[in-house]
């Protein structure tokens, strides 16, 4: 039941291995979620060496996996959201073929 897609491991930084993560980092919408929470002080690879990694998408660093992934914009896919999906207009195509 494990599926992995579009994950890139940032280069290991030995000085990070002693860090502990006690502060929350997921931003949530609505209610009190994500409010009054301090950001973690640790370096986020998305703000550094992976700043421009996601071409048409948002870079996300997953701490548990020590990996970077991209949340692609609509119609884009691929490891760096660099590929555009060529969606065919199936409804139009089918009506034209009749």
């Amino acid at each position: 039941s494990v599926r992995v897609e579009q994950v890139v491991k940032p280069p290991q930084n030995k000085t990070e291995s002693e860090n502990t993560s006690d502060k929350p980092k997921r931003k949530k919408k609505g209610g009190k979620n994500g409010k009054n929470r301090r950001n973690r002080k640790k370096k986020n690879p998305c703000n550094a060496e992976f700043q421009n990694f996601c071409i048409h998408g948002e870079c996300k660093y997953i701490e548990h996996l020590e990996a970077v992934t991209c949340k692609c914009q609509q119609e884009y896919f691929g490891e760096r959201c660099g590929e555009k999906s060529m969606k065919t207009h199936s409804m139009i195509d089918s009506s034209l073929s009749k």
């Epitope: 291995s17 006690d22 929350p24 996300k60």
Partner: antibody, heavy 125, light 112 residues
């Protein structure tokens, strides 16, 4: 077959220390975050600690922060929990658990998909 | 911290009937339409076993009579129809990326 085998439990006096180990097999150990979860006799489950795939990120609840240290040796496929300044309320069965996950469209969803049989830690004078 | 409250604390159900366990979170565990709640079954003397992840997805090998639903702060585990072997404690757990990764206090299911 995924297997997690805990060891190192036993009887220890309050204020004492203990080191738990979890030997993992049947999967690529360094691809998964790992956790310790405990269960006091007759009580519910309590999350104790989590460590990221390479050990760079560790997480603890307030109840054990500063006393417990989680670590891992990916070369040995092993997870550890160093427990210091033990208290009577730390008495529990300690389980090691793997973080299964789904990763799609930039979303990461995880869950404890495999658990060891547990090792009993008793803190008593 | 997110607090999970399960109800009822215990219930007794006859074989063939429906068992419903609820889990209420003190704040939303949703993120962009994804619900970060998991359900576990624990039989006496055994470690917990994953039943449902991400609120409604059954783990491999989990019988069809188990189902999960809900979003936001309210989640439900349903067992229908209940079988004798379902006697166990059931726990919900929140798996956002925000520690602590809390569990509900548990629900004890007994078969009449």
């Amino acid at each position: 077959e995924v297997q997690l085998v805990e060891s190192g439990g036993g009887l220890v006096k309050p204020g004492g220390s203990l080191r738990l180990s979890c030997a993992a097999s049947g999967f690529t150990f360094n691809s998964y975050a790992m956790s310790w979860v405990r269960q006091a006799p007759g009580k519910g489950l309590e999350w104790v600690s989590t460590i990221s795939t390479g050990g760079s990120h560790t997480y603890y609840p307030d109840s054990v922060k500063g006393r417990f240290t989680i670590s891992r040796d990916n070369a040995k496929n092993s997870l550890y929990l160093q427990m210091n300044s033990l208290r009577a309320e730390d008495t529990a069965v300690y389980y090691c658990a793997r973080h299964g996950y789904l990763l799609y469209d930039g979303y990461y969803e995880w869950y404890f998909d495999y658990w060891g049989q547990g090792t009993l830690v008793t803190v008593s004078s | 911290d997110i607090v999970l409250t399960q109800s009822p604390a215990s219930l007794a159900v006859s074989p063939g009937q429906r068992a419903t366990i609820t889990c209420r979170a003190s704040e939303s565990v949703d993120y962009d339409g994804h619900s970060f709640i998991n359900w576990y079954q624990q039989k006496p003397g055994q470690p917990p076993k994953l039943l449902i992840y991400a609120a409604s997805n059954k783990d491999t090998g989990v019988p069809a009579r188990f189902s999960g639903s809900g979003s936001g702060t309210d989640f439900t585990l349903t067992i229908n129809p209940v079988e004798a072997e379902d006697t166990a404690n059931y726990y919900c757990q929140q798996s956002t990326e925000d520690p602590p990764y809390t569990f509900g206090q548990g629900t004890k299911l007994e078969i009449k």
